[in-house]
């Protein structure tokens, strides 16, 4: 439902996609019970949500992962919500960290990130993780979205 | 504060309720510092939030639980946010999983779920967990809500 | 972008600040990629977000901490989102609990809290933790905010 032509609702919710790429940037898709309100927010290259209008946005991500302390590096599993604005440095907006489980073969844990940020036209947000191979892609486990205030 | 008669604010926040029922669906109550903006969202049978208007909603749940690896099944504790729409499949919207703690008698952990979804008139959302007996019902620990964009 | 003079957007997102104070109330700052929409929400004494207008607000906090089971008390790490309204008792709105990790020297974990609440003019919200010395203040790890519906 639109608030009016001048002020349409802008919202997105995308679903995690397993990827053979070795990049730490998570991949997303418009599948399952996804949301893409209109073309004022788009999923670009399966990796970032890009907005056309300046304003305040509540941005969130949820990442479920399965890891084991012995099989993983000493460092914890970290998920980062990052911002790329035209002509600016990339920025970390939010991060969460969970130490690996001692459960075998691996222990599942879920991370939730969310916050209100000002985005410029053409700004993109994306999610980075320390080890994408540990991310769980079962129904509903890992997702990413935003809504314009 | 209303946005106008045509577009009133719609929001709810309900509080967990211990239940003797053996169902995996969590029970909720309008108690403590709860929110129920108007009759366009209702808590039905103490288990589901039902909306009267179609639109985009940010839906969230928080579940705190206390479990022990030895006393629990091998499977992790999973919380699921589910959707029931008239004449449709029930759907898993969001899930989070946490492996049981090795702490004794049990170790507390908290899960947060949240995302933007399109709801149809008469749609209901509810929360499922793998073991309701492990859920913590102390003040503020477990809650469930939504807001219409 | 404003909704109009009568109904301006109200939102805040503040960043954690390490503190030498022994209080359990977390300290925050308008630094880094913070949000403070206008003077209808303010950060007071670096510890609480105070609103001038009555209404429904989505309030959230994220706390990352690093703790060890042997070095910590038996009790879990608890983060609480609390409300102070003029002439009322303080209230706990939301809490999350995580048992300490067995990782050494400490294991990182992240907690996310969020919910919709009615706030009165002059109401303040703040975040309490069981042990502020365990909180992680690296970029993006610990933050606190709200948005008016």
């Amino acid at each position: 439902m639109q608030k009016g032509d001048q002020n349409p609702q802008i919202a997105a919710h995308v679903i995690s996609e397993a990827s053979s790429k070795t990049t730490s940037v998570l991949q997303w898709a418009e599948k399952g019970y996804y949301t893409m309100s209109n073309n004022l927010v788009t999923l670009e290259n399966g990796k970032q949500l890009t907005v056309k209008r300046q304003g305040l946005y509540y941005i969130y991500a949820q990442v479920t992962f399965c890891s084991n302390r012995e099989a993983s590096s000493q460092a914890p599993f970290i998920a980062s919500l990052c911002l790329k604005s035209p002509g600016r440095f990339e920025r970390i907006l939010l991060r969460a960290a969970n130490t690996h489980s001692s459960a075998k073969p691996c222990g599942q844990q879920s991370i939730h990130l969310g916050g209100v940020f000002e985005l410029q036209p053409g700004a993109s947000v994306f999610v980075n993780v320390t080890d994408p191979s540990q991310v769980s892609h079962g129904t509903g486990f890992t997702s990413f979205g935003l809504l314009k205030l | 504060m209303q946005k106008g008669d045509q577009n009133p604010q719609i929001a709810a926040h309900v509080i967990s309720e211990a239940s003797s029922k053996t169902t995996s669906v969590l029970q909720w109550a309008e108690k403590g510092y709860y929110t129920m903006s108007n009759n366009l969202v209702t808590l039905e049978n103490g288990k589901q939030l039902t909306v009267k208007r179609q639109g985009l909603y940010y839906i969230y749940a928080q579940v705190t639980f206390c479990s022990n690896r030895e006393a629990s099944s091998q499977a992790p504790f999973i919380a699921s946010l589910c959707l029931k729409s008239p004449g449709r499949f029930e759907r898993i919207l969001l899930r989070a999983a946490n492996t049981h703690s090795s702490a004794k008698p049990c170790g507390q952990q908290s899960i947060h779920l949240g995302g933007v979804f399109e709801l149809q008139p008469g749609a209901s959302v509810f929360v499922n967990v793998t073991d309701p007996s492990q859920v913590s019902h102390g003040t503020g620990f477990t809650s469930f809500g939504l807001l219409k964009l | 972008m404003q909704k109009g003079d009568q109904n301006p957007q109200i939102a805040a997102h503040v960043i954690s600040e390490a503190s030498s104070k022994t209080t359990s109330v977390l300290q925050w700052a308008e630094k880094g990629y913070y949000t403070m929409s206008n003077n209808l929400v303010t950060l007071e004494n670096g510890k609480q977000l105070t609103v001038k207008r009555q209404g429904l607000y989505y309030i959230y906090a994220q706390v990352t901490f690093c703790s060890n089971r042997e070095a910590s008390s038996q009790a879990p790490f608890i983060a609480s989102l609390c409300l102070k309204s003029p002439g009322r008792f303080e209230r706990i709105l939301l809490r999350a609990a995580n048992t300490h990790s067995s990782a050494k020297p400490c294991g990182q974990q992240s907690i996310h809290l969020g919910g919709v609440f009615e706030l009165q003019p002059g109401a303040s919200v703040f975040v309490n933790v069981t042990d502020p010395s365990q909180v992680s203040h690296g970029t993006g790890f610990t933050s606190f905010g709200l948005l008016k519906l």
């Epitope: 599948k31 399952g32 019970y33 079962g138 129904t139 | 499949f89 898993i92 399109e118 | -």
Partner: nanobody, 123 residues
Framework: EVQLVESGGGLVQPGGSLRLSCAAS????????MGWFRQAPGKEREFIAV????????LYADSVKGRFTISADNSKNTAYLQMNSLKPEDTAVYYC????????????????WGQGTLVTVSS
């Protein structure tokens, strides 16, 4: 489009069991979930169970929880509904349905439907 063919219906006594099958053909790769609805005479079609093709997660209507089990055999492109402890009120035409993968929350996607199979529970 996905073609669905149900089988396994019939007459059974109260307390008995039946296993329904739903064989899918056509654009199987486009299926997100498969499940079962039922319609009793003079009543609305009601949801019974669903299974997600992706990972085997399932959900059930309260009326059948603990008695019915949904499963899938991906190699045979078939979904099953094992019905135990059947009651007279389970009497209905049972329909298999498939939901497309990229259905999205912003549109009510049309399901693909089977022709239905009759289950009668009576002594």
């Amino acid at each position: 489009e996905v073609q669905l063919v149900e089988s396994g219906g019939g007459l059974v006594q109260p307390g008995g069991s039946l296993r329904l099958s739903c064989a899918a053909s056509g654009s199987i790769s486009s299926v997100n979930a498969m499940g079962w609805f039922r319609q009793a005479p003079g009543k609305e079609r009601e949801f019974i169970a669903v299974i997600y093709w992706r990972d085997g997660s399932s959900l059930y209507a309260d009326s059948v929880k603990g008695r019915f089990t949904i499963s899938a055999d991906n190699s045979k492109n078939t979904a099953y509904l094992q019905m135990n402890s059947l009651k007279p009120e389970d009497t209905a035409v049972y329909y298999c349905a498939a939901e497309p993968y990229g259905s999205g929350s912003s549109l009510i996607s049309e399901y693909d439907w089977g022709q239905g199979t009759l289950v009668t529970v009576s002594s």
